[in-house]
């Protein structure tokens, strides 16, 4: 079943390559288990950036060696992506799945355009 | 008389606070004197950033204390804005006026959203 997911249109990564945004879903029921996946779309290619699963009220557990961290609060997930470089500029899509209890719900946001600027190297200290 | 002006939707300033974009106008005739003005729109406030007048085939002349520089080539103006900081993020609108010979033409672009990220300060050298 479809579910609405909202996320900001544009976010700027910091000069340290860190970008944060909120992914909010309109939960149709009382889900106790939620799965969040961040997808990156660039040049019509979609790749998975990171994924997390959590019990509502608990911390997000990111899977594998993730470049993402996050916290949850109600129907909001606060996502932070680290280690970004200029070449990582692209559309970052938030996908939310309500896994338990049935019925299963799936929602996909319109994406957040993350802009990343590589910093100038600091001058060598003499 | 109205004239079409095209400019990119989004531009990222470099980590040095420099942003460049092209402003292109569809010249209905052979103008010899052109005036280009860059306006910044933020929070429904519109302010002038810089302005230049040039004779076609010649260099753009910005005022000495201007944060803008630029070159012209045919119906294109290559604009560079320097000294930008994060607080300068906003919509930069290109306004082109064909001043001479008559008739006078005016064109205003849809604006280029310039994003600026302040760099991290370099560590002090010991």
């Amino acid at each position: 079943k479809a579910m609405h997911v909202a996320q900001p249109a544009v976010v700027l990564a910091s000069s340290r390559g860190i970008a944060s945004f909120v992914c909010e879903y309109a939960s149709p029921g009382k889900a106790t288990e939620v799965r969040v996946t961040v997808l990156r779309q660039a040049d019509s290619q979609v790749t998975e950036v990171c994924a997390a699963t959590y019990m509502t009220g608990n911390e997000l557990t990111f899977l594998d060696d993730s470049i993402c961290t996050g916290t949850s609060s109600g129907n909001q997930v606060n996502l932070t992506i680290q280690g970004l470089r200029a070449m990582d500029t692209g559309l970052y899509i938030c996908k939310v799945e309500l896994m338990y209890p049935p019925p299963y719900y799936l929602g996909i946001g319109n994406g957040t355009q993350i802009y990343v600027i590589d910093p100038e190297p600091c001058p060598d200290s003499d | 008389k109205a004239m079409h002006v095209a400019q990119p939707a989004v531009v990222l300033a470099s980590s040095r606070g420099i942003a460049s974009f092209v402003c292109e106008y569809a010249s209905p005739g052979k103008a010899t004197e052109v005036r280009v003005t860059v306006l910044r729109q933020a929070d429904s406030q519109v302010t002038e950033v810089c302005a230049a007048t040039y004779m076609t085939g010649n260099e753009l002349t910005f005022l000495d204390d201007s944060i803008c520089t630029g070159t012209s080539s045919g119906n294109q103006v290559n604009l560079t804005i320097q000294g930008l900081r994060a607080m300068d993020t906003g919509l930069y609108i290109c306004k082109v006026e064909l001043m001479y010979p008559p008739p006078y033409y005016l064109g205003i672009g849809n604006g280029t959203q310039i994003y600026v990220i302040d760099p991290e300060p370099c560590p002090d050298s010991d």
Partner: antibody, heavy 123, light 107 residues
Framework: QVKLQESGAELVRPGASVTLSCKAS????????MHWMKQTPVHGLEWIGV????????TYNQKFKGKATLTADKSSSTAYMEFLSLTSEDSAVYYC????????????????WGQGTSVTVSS | DIVMTQTTASLSASVGETVTITCRAS??????LAWYQQKQGRSPQLLVY???TLGDGVPSRFSGSGSGTQYSLKINSLQPEDFGSYYC?????????FGGGTKLEIK
């Protein structure tokens, strides 16, 4: 011990419907999801859908939406699957299975299966 | 839908040998994978879940491994009762699809 007892084999005519049952014992019926599977030599094992007996919440595999209807009766600890408008493609062995842990992150598994019900669609 | 591929449809081995059965997912399933054994005319039995956790009562000669899209089931020192069909199943996004199965036969 945990047991899922499925109803007996069925021989049905094309166009008819059939209802399969799965009686659970040895655990609290409403504490676990009940899933249904289809197995054929051609398509192998396929997940049909799941029902939460506690809430009645259901998720179907899109492929079986409109074909299968899942229900559960808490009073008799029995799950049911009605299969509609049968064709020869629906001839298969159907299993009910229990998901092993109720809402435990990172613990998805079908830990107990019924013995299976063979359905043959033939005129 | 996520496609689960078991490239080896059948495999012959002798008692005492070690065999490895593989399963590939069409996208990252983050270890949300189970392995089942099925003997002729019987229902599937759980062997491994979470890609590498043995089910209750499953002999230690069975082991699961893998991550991302590539997973495998290893059986050390094959016993006569190990012959049958083996299926992988993912639990990432619904529908929770199965691999086509690998039939392990006695050589």
């Amino acid at each position: 011990q945990v047991k899922l007892q499925e109803s007996g084999a069925e021989l049905v005519r094309p166009g008819a419907s059939v209802t399969l049952s799965c009686k659970a014992s040895g655990y609290t019926f409403t504490d676990y999801e009940m899933h249904w599977m289809k197995q054929t030599p051609v398509h192998g094992l396929e997940w049909i859908g799941v029902i939460d007996p506690e809430t009645g919440g259901i998720t179907y595999n899109q492929k079986f939406k409109g074909k299968a209807t899942l229900t559960a009766d808490k009073s008799s600890s029995t799950a049911y699957m009605e299969f509609l408008s049968l064709t020869s493609e629906d001839s298969a062995v159907y299993y009910c299975t229990r998901r092993g842990a109720r809402a435990t992150v990172y613990n998805y598994v079908m830990d107990y299966w019924g013995q299976g019900t063979s359905v043959t669609v033939s005129s | 839908d996520i496609v689960m591929t078991q490239t080896t449809a059948s495999l012959s081995a002798s008692v005492g040998e070690t065999v490895t059965i593989t399963c590939r997912a069409s996208e990252n399933i983050h270890n949300y994978l189970a392995w089942y054994q099925q003997k002729q005319g019987r229902s599937p039995q759980l062997l491994v879940y979470n890609a590498k956790t043995l089910g209750d009562g499953v002999p230690s000669r069975f082991s699961g491994s893998g991550s991302g899209t590539q997973y495998s089931l290893k059986i050390n020192s094959l016993q006569p009762e190990d012959f049958g069909s083996y299926y992988c199943q993912h639990f990432w996004s619904t529908p929770w699809t199965f691999g086509g199965g690998t039939k392990l036969e006695i050589k």
